[in-house]
Interface confidence: medium
């Protein structure tokens, strides 16, 4: 992973997270070069024998690509000339997590930067009024999470209240045996209040809000990836 040579160029990466089964981006930028044929991009990963991806002389060079990444990687070829070395990773796997190195060679010099890539599953929760229940009940559902998250309920009226005694959360393994469906039920709901179902693991934090009044129900969802930093 070491580099040598008198000249060094600035390479910048951003820590990110990938959603299992979906496509992800490993971000990397560098000081651009006017000549595409002089740019070499190598992506490496700790614990992997071959390369993750290599781009040189204006095209992919995949003879040394490790089998676990075969057919799953691509750079944005039209953006390399402006200093974008980001890697698109298709069908993110749990095992894609780890430390990656973006290594750049241009006519100006060499440079590299590490990137921490987390993998998991995260999805927007949906909060609904459960009309089948015997009492006023809210049901919060999110289809895909991994690792197992925590679920916390909060309310606008009863700020700081602990709802753990009046809620029940279950985790149901999905068919691929990795991710899980999250279902949390909140009992004894009062009208004219806004309730929040907050789901969080070390990858992401998601919130589903529901405002229940006599005349209407309003919903809002928000998802935020955690620990993404330059």
């Amino acid at each position: 992973f070491g580099i040598s040579g008198r000249h060094s160029i600035t390479v910048t990466t951003v820590a990110s997270a990938g959603n299992i089964g979906e496509d992800g981006i490993l971000s990397c930028t560098f000081e651009p070069d006017i000549k595409l044929s002089d740019i070499v991009i190598q992506w490496l990963k700790e614990g992997v024998l071959g390369l993750v991806h290599e781009f040189k002389e204006g095209k992919d060079e995949l003879s040394e690509q490790d089998e676990m990444f075969r057919g799953r990687t691509a750079v944005f070829a039209d953006q390399v000339i402006v200093g974008n070395a980001s890697l698109r990773l298709k069908n993110v796997q749990l095992t894609d997590a780890g430390t990656y190195k973006c290594y750049i060679i241009t006519s100006k010099g060499k440079g590299n930067a590490n990137l921490e890539y987390k993998t998991g599953a995260f999805s927007m929760p949906e909060v609904n009024v459960d009309y089948n229940a015997s009492s006023e009940t809210l049901r919060c559902e999110a289809p895909r999470w991994f690792p197992q998250p925590t679920v916390v309920w909060a309310s606008q009226v009863d700020q700081g209240a602990n709802f753990s005694e009046v809620s029940n959360t279950s985790f149901e393994l999905n068919s691929e045996n990795v991710t899980m469906k999250v279902v949390s039920v909140l009992y004894n709901v009062t009208i004219n209040n806004t309730y929040s179902c907050m789901i969080e693991n070390d990858i992401a934090k998601a919130t589903g809000d529901i405002k229940v009044t006599e005349s209407e129900i309003k919903r809002r969802s928000h998802l935020q990836l955690l620990n993404s930093k330059a």
Epitope: E46, G50, E67, G98
Partner: antibody, heavy 116, light 107 residues
């Protein structure tokens, strides 16, 4: 069927040489990195060397560095281990293994005995 | 070099028992850990990769857990064919290193 078959083991005197081969079948050999792992009689597993799919990345255990050479011929679907300056402590069963998510396919092993 | 230490080195158990084998790395290896099973005179067989992922074709009674420095292989209900030696192996960095092995014997 995915298979690895080692050959080339035998009895050799200290200081002598041997070349082990590992013939691969049932998968696209040129797409996978490969390892050599050995096991001395009654002992545990010891990693020896690794080579990436197109031979650009090669790694050795300190105990064999400078004496052993790992190589491959993708046109022949074959992995090699050239062993020179053999010592008594190199006596072991030598396995080749495919590098995937873990060493997921192993050969049956070939026995190397270094003795005078 | 990263040292891998397994415990116990051997254990006696009966069919149906829950068996736990631990593996400790001398430094953090994140989740870069594999578990292998080896029977006398046979090549090792991959059971678990990346600390907790079950290799295709391996019975679900085998499971792996842990990250960083401490890892566990669990056999939920020991079967007659599970009596063997088990090895952990790190692939966080070269040299790749194995634990010394844990022999699971019939009680």
């Amino acid at each position: 069927e995915v298979q690895l078959l080692e050959s080339g083991g035998g009895l050799v005197q200290p200081g002598g040489s041997l070349r082990l081969s590992c013939a691969a079948s049932g998968f696209t050999f040129s797409s996978y990195g490969m390892h050599w792992v050995r096991q001395a009689p009654g002992k545990g597993l010891e990693w020896v060397a690794s080579i990436s799919s197109s031979s650009g990345y090669i790694y050795y255990a300190d105990s064999v560095k400078g004496r052993f050479t790992i190589s491959r011929d993708n046109s022949k679907n074959t992995l090699y281990l050239q062993m020179n300056s053999l010592r008594a402590e190199d006596t072991a069963v030598y396995y080749c293994a495919r590098a995937s998510s873990g060493m997921d396919v192993w050969g049956q092993g070939t026995t190397v005995t270094v003795s005078s | 070099d990263i040292q891998m230490t397994q415990s116990p080195s051997s254990l006696s158990a009966s069919v149906g028992d829950r068996v736990t084998i631990t593996c400790r790395a001398s430094q953090s290896i994140r989740s870069y850990l594999n578990w292998y099973q080896q029977k006398p005179g046979k090549a090792p067989k991959l059971l678990i990769y990346y600390a907790s992922s079950l290799q295709s074709g391996v019975p679900s009674r085998f499971s792996g857990s842990g990250s960083g420095t401490d890892f566990t292989l669990t056999i939920s209900s020991l079967q007659p064919e599970d009596f063997a030696t088990y090895y952990c192996q790190q692939y966080y960095s070269t040299p790749l290193t194995f634990g010394q092995g844990t022999k699971v014997e019939i009680k």
